[in-house]
């Protein structure tokens, strides 16, 4: 039941301060995971 | 229903070592990132250690980092906390809780697990 | 770190009454907050995440509020299962960290 704050997509931008790898070192979930590669291929 | 049944709290001397077990059921375990948080008595609540999907990211507070290891056995459905030169202030109750992914609200808690330190 | 700071620390209130417990982060948060509410002996129940969103099982007569750096939560007519111990929590970024926690009395 519920969860969190739910985000649309993994990261539109940056946030100040933030790096790939600062964001990398965060990820806890396999959907989190998976988010983040997501994001890395369509930067390329 | 997801369920989180924790074990191996106790009395332990200062200095020395204890292992808390958290078993998870009722959701794919493996899938989640699993926190521990400690409660002293009649305070506070503080979180302790994190540790993501396949291990893969670590993190700890302050107060326990180079003493505590959080680990996981996927196998078993089972998230652990290894504490090693517990001092008098590790006293507390230890919850183990799970949350959907980073920067997402805890959603289900073990029901607590009391550890005391004292000789 | 971020500091969460939760105001009162306890307040003394009777059954029908509206409770506001507020809650402010040292930096900005966005809207990473969750209230969570626990009883004597027993586990944190989780009331709301996301600052405002409802977690499944609790009932509407909880509400939490904010963004930023200013969030609250309240009881629109405390009833006698609701005395007990209210705690924020910031998700934002780690360490994650509490409020101080503000017990509800019976007056």
């Known amino acids: 039941g519920g969860g969190g704050s739910k985000h649309k997509c993994f990261r539109n931008s940056l946030e100040n301060n933030e790096t790939l790898e600062s964001i990398m070192n965060t990820l806890e979930s396999e959907e989190d995971f998976r988010k983040y590669f997501y994001y890395l291929e369509g930067s390329k | 229903q997801v369920q989180l049944v924790q074990s191996g709290g106790g009395v332990v001397q200062p200095g020395r070592s204890l292992r808390l077990s958290c078993a998870a059921s009722g959701f794919s375990f493996s899938s989640f990132g699993m926190h521990w948080v400690r409660q002293a008595p009649g305070k506070g609540l503080e979180w302790v250690a994190v540790i993501s999907y396949g291990g893969i990211n670590k993190h700890y507070s302050d107060s326990v980092k180079g003493r505590f290891t959080i680990s996981r056995d996927d196998s078993k459905n089972t998230l652990y906390l290894q504490m090693n030169s517990l001092r008098a202030e590790d006293t507390a109750v230890y919850y183990c809780?799970?949350?959907?992914?980073?920067?997402?609200?805890?959603?289900?808690w073990g029901q607590g697990t009391l550890v005391t330190v004292s000789s | 770190d971020i500091q969460m700071t939760q105001s009162p620390s306890s307040l003394s209130a009777s059954v029908g009454d509206r409770v506001t417990i507020t809650c402010r982060a040292s930096q900005g948060i966005s809207n990473y907050l969750a209230w969570f509410q626990q009883k004597p002996g027993k586990a944190p129940k989780s009331l709301i995440y996301?600052?405002?969103s409802l977690q499944s099982g609790v009932p509407s007569k909880f509400s939490g509020s904010g963004s930023g750096t200013d969030f609250t939560l309240t009881i629109s007519s405390l009833q006698p299962e609701d005395f007990a111990t209210y705690y924020c929590q910031q998700y934002n970024s780690y360490p994650l960290t509490f409020g101080g926690g503000t017990k509800v009395e019976i007056k």
């Open positions: 996301g600052a405002s």
């Open positions: 809780a799970k949350r959907e992914g980073y920067r997402y609200a805890y959603d289900y």
